[in-house]
């Protein structure tokens, strides 16, 4: 088992909103839970954009998930990751 590296980035969306993206890479096996939580509660599937789980060329895998949030509310959002029985939460950088 190889645990993922998780990286959270932000980019400007429309006025007053930002897109936050959570990327997991370098993990094995490919089964992973990666999702955005608002106040610790998972967002509905239709309010998140998902990337496929793809091989990254080193025998490991990568994927991503993104959502749009109100600027100034970054603290409420975390990326939740679960892989091979381990879990972690990752805040949005300010």
């Amino acid at each position: 088992t190889v645990p993922p590296m998780v990286n959270v980035t932000r980019s400007e969306a429309s006025e007053g909103n930002i897109t936050v993206t959570c990327r997991a890479s370098g993990f094995y096996p490919w089964n992973i839970t990666l999702s955005w939580r608002q106040d610790g509660v998972s967002l509905s599937h239709d309010t998140q954009q998902w990337g496929d789980v793809l091989p990254d060329g080193n025998g490991t895998y990568q994927t991503w998930v993104a959502t749009r949030i109100c600027q100034g509310e970054e603290q409420r959002f975390t990326c939740y990751m679960e892989h091979s029985g381990n879990h972690s939460t990752h805040p949005v950088p300010s």
Epitope: D39, G40, V41, L43, S44, T47, T89
Partner: antibody, heavy 118, light 112 residues
Framework: EIQLQQSGPELVKPGASVKVSCTAS????????IYWVKQSHGKSLEWIGY????????ISNQKFTGRATLTVDKSSSTAYLHLNSLTSEDSAVYYC???????????WGAGTTVTVSS | DILMTQTPLSLPVSLGDQASISCRSS???????????LEWYLQKPGQSPKLLIY???NRFSGVPDRFSGSGSGTDFTLKISRVEAEDLGVYYC?????????FGSGTKVEIK
């Protein structure tokens, strides 16, 4: 079985402080936030705030800022609500609660009654 | 703060009746990403509240299908198709789309 066990009733004097505990069992404590909710006698519910046990990060209702402090002890899977400078307005039942996958308060503690009286 | 206004405050019913509770928010509780965190709870005397409905219309595990939630934007409704004795108590709507999270003032469902 997922459970949230709260500490017993408290009778405190005005101006004093109180610490209410909420001990989680039946799940990985750091996986879910712990929320705190106030219910004054015969009244509606009021959200106080929440804490992420994994990071220790908190978000609170501004109404309680400076009066309510949320902490956790990961080693004992326990969350705490510390209320200071108590007045009669703080007499209430205080609940801790835990969210689930897509919902906010799926599991509740039984509540802790705090009575502020001289 | 978002004000959640519930009507009626009291709802006398006969067992087997349909019951309907309205909850209106003072502004839209649809979040930027489309998420709507609107939930319904039932509290019986001397007990902690219990979750019935989450994200507007999803029944929580173990909740009978006589309970249904609907609505969007600022107007939401909880319906009980045939009221049973165990459904009596105080119902609260709750929004968690915007901080501070707020509850409605409650609707007491009681026997007529």
């Amino acid at each position: 079985e997922i459970q949230l066990q709260q500490s017993g009733p408290e009778l405190v004097k005005p101006g004093a402080s109180v610490k209410v505990s909420c001990t989680a069992s039946g799940y990985a404590f750091t996986k879910y936030n712990i929320y705190w909710v106030k219910q004054s006698h015969g009244k509606s519910l009021e959200w106080i705030g929440y804490i992420d046990p994994y990071t220790g990060g908190t978000i609170s209702n501004q109404k309680f800022t400076g009066r309510a402090t949320l902490t956790v002890d990961k080693s004992s899977s326990t969350a705490y609500l510390h209320l200071n400078s108590l007045t009669s307005e703080d007499s209430a039942v205080y609940y801790c609660a835990r969210p689930g996958s897509y919902w906010y308060f799926g599991v509740w503690g039984a509540g802790t009654t705090v009575t502020v009286s001289s | 703060d978002i004000l959640m206004t519930q009507t009626p405050l009291s709802l006398p019913v006969s067992l087997g009746d349909q019951a309907s509770i309205s909850c209106r928010s003072s502004q839209s509780i649809v979040y930027t990403n489309g998420n709507t965190n609107l939930e319904w709870y039932l509290q019986k005397p001397g007990q902690s509240p219990k979750l019935l409905i989450y994200k507007v219309s999803n029944r929580f595990s173990g909740v009978p299908d006589r309970f249904s939630g609907s609505g969007s934007g600022t107007d939401f409704t909880l319906k009980i198709s045939r009221v049973e004795a165990e459904d009596l108590g105080v119902y609260y709507c709750f929004q968690a789309s915007y901080v501070p999270f707020t509850f409605g003032s409650g609707t007491k469902v009681e026997i007529k």
